[in-house]
């Protein structure tokens, strides 16, 4: 199920309005074109290091290279969290850390990177060929996951080079899909721009919808779309958030900014409620991995300011991993 925002329809201009509206309507294609060209794909890197002092002790470091704000990091081993992996730690940027043996110490290194020390003794201690995965849930990018392990010939004290992600085996389909959509969008915008030279400036007008239709709704990524791809360790980013155009522009004309519900996302870094300010309508591709973003209109019960966790349409605990921790 995917909820679509109401996208205003293009209408011929009303007589006498071309001059007033022309410069405004020119802005939209250029803004979108710029965003098309600059839209970057976030990445996750994973570094696994065996400590020289304790041969079976590991340090895992993970980082997120993206512009969004991180809402949760999950570190697992034996494969990704949802695909047979076991959760080692869950880190929330404001609420803290839950960790599990053999994790000895999980911590935030920066606002976008974490480290996890695994102790080396006991039945659950890691071995050299163990795969460690880090999943970053961020807004607006969605969930991004990368996995890494020590190379077979690693010397103690050496680390595996950081594994960038989306890793090839995981995100090939997603990258192709994203590229296709972006390419199509950019070509279409160029086409619009070319037409614009030969026609009077069109005026954007909200499409006629029923009064019950919400003006801005979040998207609910399809759970099935990823399963159908059958890619192991996949974090396929295929769900595209429709840009919602704010029809209540104070100057009477349309606004070119996405209208986000103010409780849909908050930066964990500080108290500034950035979601209430206009944000460029970027075609953000979010992971369909765990249905992180659902109906943003439904706020979870007694969730604190700046800490909204996104509800899942299947119920309040449907998004939890094997830990019972989001």
């Amino acid at each position: 199920m995917r909820t679509e925002a109401q996208v205003p329809a293009l209408q011929p201009p009303e007589p006498g309005l071309e001059g007033a509206m022309g410069h405004r309507t020119l802005v939209l294609p250029w803004v979108l074109l710029t965003l098309c060209v600059t839209a970057g794909t976030p990445e996750v890197w994973v570094q696994v290091r065996m400590e020289a002092t304790e041969l079976s002790s590991f340090t895992i470091r993970c980082g997120f290279l993206g512009s969004g704000s991180i809402s949760l990091v999950t570190v697992s081993w034996g494969g990704p969290n949802g695909a047979g992996g076991t959760t080692l730690a869950v880190l929330h940027p404001e609420r803290g850390i839950r960790q599990w043996a053999p994790a000895r110490q999980a911590r935030w290194e920066t606002q976008s990177s974490i480290s996890l020390i695994l102790e080396g003794s006991g039945a659950s201690s890691p071995c050299a060929n163990t795969t460690f995965c880090c999943k970053f849930a961020s807004f607006p990018e969605g969930s991004w996951e990368a996995c890494g392990s020590l190379p077979p010939s690693s010397d103690p004290g050496l680390s595996a080079p950081p594994t960038p992600a989306p890793i090839l085996r995981a995100d090939l389909a997603g990258i192709l899909g994203v590229s296709g959509v972006l390419l199509f969008g950019c070509v279409y915008l160029l086409h619009l721009l070319r037409r614009h030279k030969h026609r009077p400036a069109p005026r954007l007008q909200p499409s006629r919808t029923s009064p019950q239709a919400p003006r801005a709704r979040a998207w609910a990524p399809s759970q099935a779309s990823q399963a159908a791809l059958h890619v192991p360790y996949a974090t396929i980013n295929t769900s595209c958030r429709p840009a919602t155009l704010d029809t209540a522009h104070p100057h009477g004309g349309p606004s070119w900014w996405a209208s986000l519900p103010t409780h849909a996302a908050h930066r964990p870094q500080g108290p500034a409620a950035w979601a209430s300010t206009p944000i460029p309508a970027r075609g953000s591709f979010v992971s369909v991995e765990n249905g992180l973003y659902a109906q943003a209109g439904e706020r979870p019960p007694h969730t604190g300011p700046g800490l909204t966790l996104f509800p899942d349409p299947r119920g309040p605990r449907a998004m939890e991993g094997p830990l019972g921790v989001r």
């Epitope: 404001e94 110490q105 969730t303 604190g304 094997p322 019972g324 921790v325």
Partner: antibody, heavy 119, light 107 residues
Framework: EVQLQQSGPELAKPGSSVKISCKAS????????IDWVKESHGKSLEWIGA????????NYNQKFKGKATLTVDKSSSTAYMELRSLTSEDSAVYYC????????????WATGTTVTVSS | DIVMTQSQKFMSTSVGDRVSITCKAS??????VDWYQQKPGQSPKALIF???NRHTGVPDRFAGSGSGTDFNLTIRNVQSEDLADYFC?????????FGGGTKLEIR
Amino acid sequence: EVQLQQSGPELAKPGSSVKISCKASGYTFTDYNIDWVKESHGKSLEWIGAIDPNNGGTNYNQKFKGKATLTVDKSSSTAYMELRSLTSEDSAVYYCTRWDSNDWYFDVWATGTTVTVSS
Amino acid sequence: DIVMTQSQKFMSTSVGDRVSITCKASQNVRSAVDWYQQKPGQSPKALIFSSSNRHTGVPDRFAGSGSGTDFNLTIRNVQSEDLADYFCLQHWNSPYTFGGGTKLEIR
């Protein structure tokens, strides 16, 4: 109604072991972690550790490693804590509590089990 | 380990008054602090989670604030049933640690 019901008071001899139970009801047992907390005179409250009923994964406060062992029985929705090699320092009230993973806090507490170690 | 310090072991107040209980963390714990109330002979009960959010059913006389290292629990219009011990807890890092507690006495 969500409830955590703990077993009754224990009187134990130094060097022996006790196993305290914590039976959950009113919710899906595997959806929430169970943590254990010690309340002793002069030491306020101390977090002992946590267990995930889903997979039996544990996390212990280093101070209680070797002292406490956390287990679960999914079929009876019961969490257990075994305390071994008991000394008078282990005389305390022990609580099991439910960790709300949506909001990250201990939302439900059991009534507690008093353990008295005396020869 | 992160040390949570509740400097006031006892606080005395009267019904109808406003009182603030403080808790200081030995390092930055963001907003990963909760407050629990323990009445005599009872188990602890959740009051405030993540620094400032009230647990379900907690009267709005109770309010939490703070982030980083300094946290406050404020009770306004104190009632006789508020006689209890109040503990802060950090879950920013393992092991989770509690403050030493503040006993609220009603004059």
